[in-house]
């Protein structure tokens, strides 16, 4: 009778497995920035170092009674979820607690910053094994808190944060909105988003994945053997921090980018009922529930990709949206999406030495999203080939002309504002393998990569009849790197990747006007990495 | 996950009204002031002064000291609560909001953020 949350995130084959680093000792250290904790609790006793760090605001109210067990409640529970002997995810992982939240669970951005700096100082004074920082707290969007998380992440520390319990867009909160943080939303025993009173888990593009966060049994600070259930995105984040600690125990050299990609790749997909989220957030919110991934030794050199959505561009005529990959990741393709369908396409450009995915709004449009496909491609050498728009009626062809480079994605960007005059671009997988083909007034961008054993192919699926969307999936063993819509009708909303599925969205009115001869096609570029093979295009 | 969320950013590029000091008069604020969009979560009176990324250790201390000196000239007492060296260059200061215009004009300042609450989730 294992608690539901542990059963959910730890597959059967891991249940009895002890995660140890190659030299036999678990050297991962988790830092918890939260309330004070009860270190003598049976679950965590001997595993927790209560640092002397304390940076909290005064409690509100003149009649506030500071009761130790209440002051310790939140932190003790989370420490138990991470490393508790009996109900913890990473049983036995050593944990350091820093007090940044007072007895009422309130802290400050400045106190959190000083806490993060304390961790950095500790790291400099006494370098150790991998560090995981758990941030089970949230405040309003803070540029400096996000920046501090970015700086700490760049030193090799893995930060895991609660998405927030405000039933709102996580991008409006910090540290949840920091791209370098693994941001975790909460689900219940039925894998549904957690409701907390009138509120609930946050959602949106700033959430990386979900994890158990409802009725989680863990250490209670009421007594040294007490347990209680608590709910929230803090509990969800604690599960992921525990998973990360276990992953790093086995493989201490895993980077933040690898950890995030593996968490996403091995999570349980499509079990969350997305109808719980506001309609405009459904496409942006990942349908992923965390599970402990197998080690890299068991899974080989799989090509891992994730989808990164930009912020909404806003409705102005020249509004652009920008989606960025993490520094270690390769941007293999860029697409765009607009709810009104009024967009001028997408392209890849270099900003400050990094390739970014950009999308442009069209006149009368309500705004666009840029959708980047970010992948881990060992020893990759990627470049962008682009061709300016062709003269009226002519096609523009772009292919990967360097030896051993394969096409991983295509982008199209229209110079003209008038949506009615242009015929939309296409990918050609037959007569001209590995080419992006654009039509009238479209600039075409081909993303070309060389990496040992990288091979790619195009897979298309078209629907002639009325349909709001067309999808095409890459088969097992292949990973979706590029996704485009090749429309028969004039107006498409765009295309984006959901895990290994390429989704092409069509405007309702276009769907109604369409004649049977004009198929809307979802075109996917599917790649795989076979380290022994050389780069190739598969027809 | 981008640079700016639902965030209040106020440009306080006020013309210098200092005591005729050349370096002060010449420096027009390009730094911005930021604060939490949720008013109830704000902590007015405490500010995180964030300096440009390449700012050296000594310059951080000098900037904090310069702010104290200039504030004192105007009859304000400010308290530097913490200096950040290791994660980013900057300092935490307790001061009147009247001094924000002055602080934004200091050399090396990239932006100033008003402190705000965070909550257990």
């Amino acid at each position: 009778s294992i608690p539901w949350n542990l059963e959910r995130i730890i597959p059967a084959w891991h249940q009895t497995e002890e995660d140890r680093s190659p030299d036999g000792s678990s050297q991962v250290e988790v830092y918890l920035l939260d309330t004070s904790i009860q270190g003598a609790h049976r679950e965590i006793e001997g595993r927790v170092t209560i640092t002397d760090f304390n940076s909290v605001p005064e409690e509100d109210g003149t009649r506030f009674h500071r009761q130790a067990s209440k002051c310790d409640s939140h932190g003790t529970h989370l420490a138990g979820v991470v490393s508790g002997r009996d109900a913890g995810v990473a049983k036995g992982t050593s944990l350091h607690s820093l007090r940044v939240l007072n007895c009422q669970g309130k802290g400050t951005v400045s106190g959190t910053l000083i806490g993060l700096e304390f961790i950095r100082k500790s790291q400099l004074i006494q370098p150790s094994g991998p560090l995981v920082v758990l941030l089970p707290l949230a405040g309003g969007y803070s540029r400096i808190l996000n920046a501090a998380c970015r700086h700490l992440a760049r030193t090799g520390v893995v930060l895991v944060a609660a998405a927030g319990n405000f039933r709102d867009d996580a991008c409006l909160y910090s540290p949840a909105s920091a791209p370098e943080v693994i941001t975790v939303g909460a689900t219940n025993a039925q894998d549904q988003p957690v409701t907390l009173g009138t509120l609930g888990t946050n959602f949106g593009r700033c959430v990386d994945l979900f994890a158990p966060g409802k009725d989680i049994i863990g250490a209670s600070s009421d007594c040294s053997t007490c347990f209680m259930s608590q709910s929230g995105t803090s509990q969800a984040a604690a599960h992921v921090a525990g998973i990360v600690a276990r992953m790093l125990s086995r493989e201490p050299t895993l980077t933040l980018a690898e950890l995030r990609q593996r968490l996403i790749h091995f999570s349980t997909k499509d079990v969350i009922n997305m109808a719980w989220f506001p309609e405009d957030q459904q496409v942006l919110t990942p349908n992923l529930v965390a599970t402990l991934p197998p080690s890299t030794h068991e899974t080989g050199g799989q090509l891992l990709c994730r989808t990164v959505w930009s912020a909404h561009s806003g409705p102005t005529r020249t509004a652009t949206a920008t989606a960025r990959c993490a520094p270690e990741e390769e941007l293999l393709s860029c697409s765009s999406f607009s709810r009104s369908g009024r967009r001028r396409g997408d392209w890849i450009e270099a900003i400050g030495g990094q390739q970014v995915c950009k999308a442009l709004n069209a006149f009368g449009g309500e705004g666009v999203y840029a959708v980047a496909r970010c992948c881990l491609v060992p020893r990759a050498n990627c470049s962008i080939h682009n061709t300016p728009a062709a003269r009226a009626g002519l096609e523009t062809h772009v292919h990967c002309h360097q030896k051993d480079h394969v096409l991983t994605g295509c982008s199209f960007h229209w110079e003209v504002e008038d949506l009615s005059v242009r015929r939309q671009p296409a990918l050609r997988s037959r007569r001209q393998p590995g080419q992006c083909v654009g039509h009238q007034a479209a600039s075409v961008y081909a993303s070309c990569c060389h990496a040992p054993g990288l091979e790619c192919k195009i897979k298309e699926h078209g629907i002639s009849g009325p349909s709001e969307q067309v999808t095409v999936a890459c088969e097992a063993g292949w990973t979706l790197t590029g996704c485009n819509v090749l429309p028969g009708a004039s107006l498409t909303l765009g295309a984006y990747s959901v895990d290994n599925l390429c989704v092409a969205r069509v405007h309702d009115t276009a769907r109604a006007d369409r004649t049977s001869g004009e198929a809307t096609v979802a075109a996917a570029i599917c790649c795989r990495s076979r380290p022994s093979a050389k780069a190739s295009w598969v027809q | 996950q981008d640079e700016d969320g639902d965030y209040e950013e106020l440009m306080l590029a006020l013309p210098s009204q200092e005591d005729g000091l050349a370096d002060e008069a010449a420096h027009v604020a390009t730094a911005t002031f930021r604060r939490c969009s949720k008013e109830a979560w704000r902590l007015p009176g405490t500010y995180i002064v964030v300096l440009m990324e390449e700012t050296q250790r000594l310059q951080i201390e000098q900037t904090a000291h310069r702010l104290q000196t200039r504030a004192a000239r105007r009859g304000y007492v400010i308290k530097v609560l913490h200096i950040f060296y290791d994660l980013f260059p900057g300092f935490l200061v307790k001061m009147s909001s009247d001094l924000l215009g002055l602080a934004l004009k200091l050399p090396h300042v990239e932006y100033i953020e008003e402190d705000s609450f965070v909550f257990a989730q």
Partner: antibody
Amino acid sequence: QLQLQESGPGLVKPSETLSLTCTVSGGSVSSSSYYWGWIRQPPGKGLEWIGSAYYSGSTYYNPSLKSRVTISVDTSKNQFSLKLSSVTAADTAVYYCARENSGVVPAAGPNWFDPWGQGTLVTVSS
Amino acid sequence: EIVLTQSPATLSLSPGERATLSCRASQSVSSYLAWYQQKPGQAPRLLIYDASNRATGIPARFSGSGSGTDFTLTISSLEPEDFAVYYCQQRRNWFTFGGGTKVEIK
């Protein structure tokens, strides 16, 4: 009905290690619902908790005895055992084994020692 | 560690009388206190847990009360089989037992 039975030598020499085993019948030591504990009672005195262990290998000891105590659970034999090293005459006592709810599974009942074995007297003497 | 002090050390009463046993903790144990009964040559038996809840099979004449630092075990009308030693135990911080109260026949 769950029953616990202590067994082991009744006489141990000073500085040696006291070893006792508790055999569980009518239930399983590998249940996630319970800890398995040892409590002792010197002749004519009160009770003292020694420590508790979980099927997974988790242990939890009285701080005053921690350096000398080892409790382990053998799920294959449905037993748990106590080892107390470097014994002195002060360790002479009746040693009881008992079950304690782990708290991990709230429905398992109160988080106290219940039931107990009938106890075994161990005398430390040369 | 939390020290539990039981009083009186010995209580001499007749069958049918009311017995009131006290247990005082050196610091608050909230309601994390239990009472056990031990008869000569037998193991202790759980009577009351979490200060006031009767364990399975325990007669209604046994009741517990209190929270924080002061607790009471009451036996409303003593039966012959109730004459024994009674121990309190806390689990707020680790596990400690009181020194015991012996209830003997007057």
